[in-house]
């Protein structure tokens, strides 16, 4: 503000600072995820908080189980509304195996490429959602190191539903999913009791993602 109380420069509100991010969500779509509606509800709540556009935040989604599918690329949609519609239509692809390392590696190698809409100089964020220990966990060390080398920030979410339903120990699973998260782990790792509880972490997850850019 000038001495004559004229506005000479306007400052964007804080939430507007956090717009330049390329976010790829890596979803476990293996058979044990149930109900799938909880996953799409989680996506809906998370995505509607985002300012999506070619000059703002971009979102891509990868789904994995035994194999990996690009549901949509970072540059596929140019508004939050379009992404919300597309996310609602994502169907669970299933699979008897949970190849988490492959899902993450495919996201790194393919989803975060310029051909699929990644922008040079824009911070890369990966959100990994899974409900069980991976069959390819012996490949995770390399995959995570590769992500580190490319400065990909990783948020990991462990869904404990199938463990709780089967009265199984979650210790090894939680340890694995924590190892996926960027450091400090406590700011990048979440766990929820079951699929329905995914929506309860949306606010905190959203805040932490956008704190990266701020």
């Amino acid at each position: 503000v000038s001495p004559t109380f004229q506005v000479v420069n306007s400052i964007a509100p804080v939430q507007e600072c956090s717009t330049q991010l390329d976010i790829v969500i890596v979803l476990d779509g293996s058979n044990s995820i149930y109900p799938w509606d909880s996953v799409t509800a989680f996506l809906n709540d998370l995505l509607e908080r985002m300012d999506i556009g070619p000059k703002q935040t971009q979102v891509g989604i990868v789904q994995y189980g035994e194999n990996v599918t690009h549901e949509f690329n970072l540059n596929k949609y140019s508004s939050t509304e379009e992404v919300l519609v597309a996310a609602k239509k994502i169907v669970q692809r299933g699979g008897r195996q949970t190849m988490t390392a492959l899902g993450i590696d495919t996201a790194r190698k393919e989803a975060f490429t310029e051909a699929r809409g990644a922008r040079r100089g824009v911070k890369k964020v990966m959100v990994i959602v899974t409900d069980g220990e991976s069959h390819d966990n012996h490949r995770l060390k390399k995959v995570i190191q590769d992500c580190e080398d490319e400065n990909i920030q990783r948020f990991s979410i462990a869904i404990l539903g199938s463990y709780n339903r089967g009265n199984l120990s979650t210790e090894k699973f939680v340890e694995e999913i924590k190892s996926i998260a960027s450091e400090p782990t406590e700011k990048h790792f979440f766990n929820v009791s079951d699929e329905l509880a995914l929506v309860t972490i949306v606010k905190a997850l959203g805040e932490r993602i956008f704190a990266l850019e701020a």
Partner: antibody, heavy 117, light 108 residues
Framework: QVQLQESGPGLVKPSQTLSLTCTVS??????????WSWIRQHPGKGLEWIGY???????YYNPSLKSRVTISVDTSKNQFSLKLSSVTAADTAVYYC?????????WGQGTTVTVSS | EIVLTQSPGTLSLSPGERATLSCRAS???????LVWYQQKPGQAPRLLLY???SRATGIPDRFSGSGSGTDFTLTISRLEPEDFAVYYC?????????FGGGTKVEIK
């Protein structure tokens, strides 16, 4: 260009421990994009994965050998090693070290180890 | 563990002919985790293909791979004299990493 070279005794007595070292040249073992593997091949037979190690020291072993195998890494020497305890004649084989990224793309030339008294 | 069965055990062909080698898995293998090697007598194996169908550095384009799930194929379009060797498939998606028993391609 990365090269691997196995070294160690070619003859080991039954019940003793087989010890081999793989020296990596032309690149750093600490570069985190690879696992460092040991594979063996019995005379006239196929290939068997023994295990591998990440530069940080995390190890992964073939369950069929796990109780007898130790793989370690020495980043200061750019080497990784294999120890196989309580050997028998069935452990006579060519032992290879290899670099594993997306498949094993660099191999040592292999060293023959005979278990005999 | 995943068992990989290669067939045939031996393939007798002449230079210039097409070789088709099969690798069958006991359970589904992601194609991203399926590789092929070539091994000549007295030598270490050499990586030919990764991701089931991507050629490794320096591998000629007469080598190609295909397949998914439990059935994978290595094809050598026109056999050169240096191609007579043993070929192994390997999966590394599940631990333990496992190799097929090999297919020997010999001169007819």
């Amino acid at each position: 260009q990365v090269q691997l070279q196995e070294s160690g005794p070619g003859l080991v007595k039954p019940s003793q421990t087989l010890s081999l070292t793989c020296t990596v040249s032309g690149g750093s073992i600490s570069r985190g994009n690879y696992y460092w593997s040991w594979i063996r091949q019995h005379p006239g037979k196929g290939l068997e994965w023994i295990g591998y190690i990440f530069y940080s020291g995390s190890t992964y072993y073939n369950p069929s050998l796990k109780s007898r195998v130790t793989i370690s890494v020495d980043t200061s020497k750019n080497q990784f090693s294999l120890k196989l305890s309580s050997v028998t004649a069935a452990d006579t084989a060519v032992y290879y070290c290899a670099r594993d990224g997306y498949g094993m793309d660099v191999w040592g030339q292999g060293t023959t180890v005979t278990v005999s008294s | 563990e995943i068992v990989l069965t290669q067939s045939p055990g031996t393939l007798s062909l002449s230079p210039g002919e097409r070789a088709t080698l099969s690798c069958r898995a006991s359970q589904s293998v992601s194609s991203s985790y399926l590789v092929w090697y070539q091994q000549k007598p007295g030598q270490a194996p050499r990586l030919l293909l990764y991701d089931a169908s991507s050629r490794a550095t320096g591998i000629p384009d007469r080598f190609s791979g295909s397949g998914s799930g439990t059935d994978f194929t290595l094809t050598i379009s026109r056999l050169e004299p240096e191609d007579f060797a043993v070929y192994y498939c390997q999966q590394y998606g599940n631990s333990p990493l496992t190799f097929g028993g090999g297919t020997k391609v010999e001169i007819k």
